[in-house]
């Protein structure tokens, strides 16, 4: 039985040209995490694998940095970065846990971080 839960940064907003940290946390399970994927809609952004470390998709290499922890930092944000982001935890023996974050990139300078997490 899958007992784990994922807490995410939820719905967040950021300014165009700025950066944002996407974070997910898996808790309430003793299952072993073997890999964490970060995806934007159907595009793979990055992978953190237990044996291979981080892999950043070539098309995002200039704008994506791994961390902190298993999170992902998006830099030089554009309005086109607005949308859904998913963290996918691959675990054994539970299987897959998925968390969802919605990011809105704003043109104005009044963007506020509407999240439960404090974004440094």
């Amino acid at each position: 039985m899958m007992t784990g839960t994922i807490e995410t940064t939820g719905n967040i907003s950021a300014e165009k040209g700025g950066s944002i940290i996407l974070q997910c946390h898996l808790s309430s399970t003793t299952a072993q995490v073997t890999q964490v994927n970060w995806e934007q809609q159907d595009q793979l952004l990055a992978i953190c694998n237990a044996d291979l470390g981080w892999h950043i998709s070539p098309s995002f290499k200039d704008r994506v940095a791994p961390g902190p922890g298993l999170g992902l930092t998006l830099q030089s944000l554009t309005v086109n970065d607005t949308g859904e982001y998913f963290c996918i935890y691959h675990t054994y023996p539970d299987g897959t846990y998925t968390g969802r974050i919605f990011l809105e990139v704003l043109e104005s300078s009044v963007a506020e971080h509407g999240a439960r997490f404090q974004i440094p």
Partner: antibody, heavy 117, light 107 residues
Framework: QVQLQQPGSELVRPGASVKLSCKAS????????MHWVKQRHGQGLEWIGN????????NYDEKFKSKVTLTVDTSSSTVYMHLSSLTSEDSAVYYC??????????WGQGTTLTVSS | DIVLTQSPATLSVTPGDSVSLSCRAS??????LHWFQQKSHESPRLLIS???QSISGIPSRFSGSGSGTDFTLSINSLETEDFGMYFC?????????FGGGTKLEIK
Amino acid sequence: QVQLQQPGSELVRPGASVKLSCKASGYTFTSYWMHWVKQRHGQGLEWIGNIFPGSDTTNYDEKFKSKVTLTVDTSSSTVYMHLSSLTSEDSAVYYCTREGLYAFDYWGQGTTLTVSS
Amino acid sequence: DIVLTQSPATLSVTPGDSVSLSCRASPNIRNSLHWFQQKSHESPRLLISYASQSISGIPSRFSGSGSGTDFTLSINSLETEDFGMYFCQQSNSWPYTFGGGTKLEIK
């Protein structure tokens, strides 16, 4: 197997600079963060900063920003930490440690830095 | 910066006892908390990652629990090799920080 090799010790004069090295082997060097940690006289551990060799991205604790510069040489799979304007307060053991999916999973043996005239 | 407070500073126990070490975070760090053991003149060794994830090669008598601000490292039936320093560390945000440590000594 994963190994992080550090020189055992360095002796430098006050006011001078030093470059500590950490040579990695046994894994894909550009796929993991490398961190540096300071420990004085067997006391607590202090996080100094980190570097991601795949992109040269760095982060520093504010306390060490004016003291430390982290660099990387991917051709030799080596991370360097440059410490400037050394004082006795910089005398400590400095560890490099790799961060993987399971946090700081491998550590170097540490370099004992002694600042003395 | 995130502050990690470990307690007690020193714990005197007998081999065979079971102990719980505490690490408190301020503010909330979800589950981004890791535990390390360090023996004299050795490098730290990872025991538990992300609050409760077991690490290959670490004896099963070590376990971790907690989330948010309160975390516990439990050691069942202490062996003589378990005595030393224990540190917690957070990776929720940069700068990463460590707790001040708990010294586990033989009574």
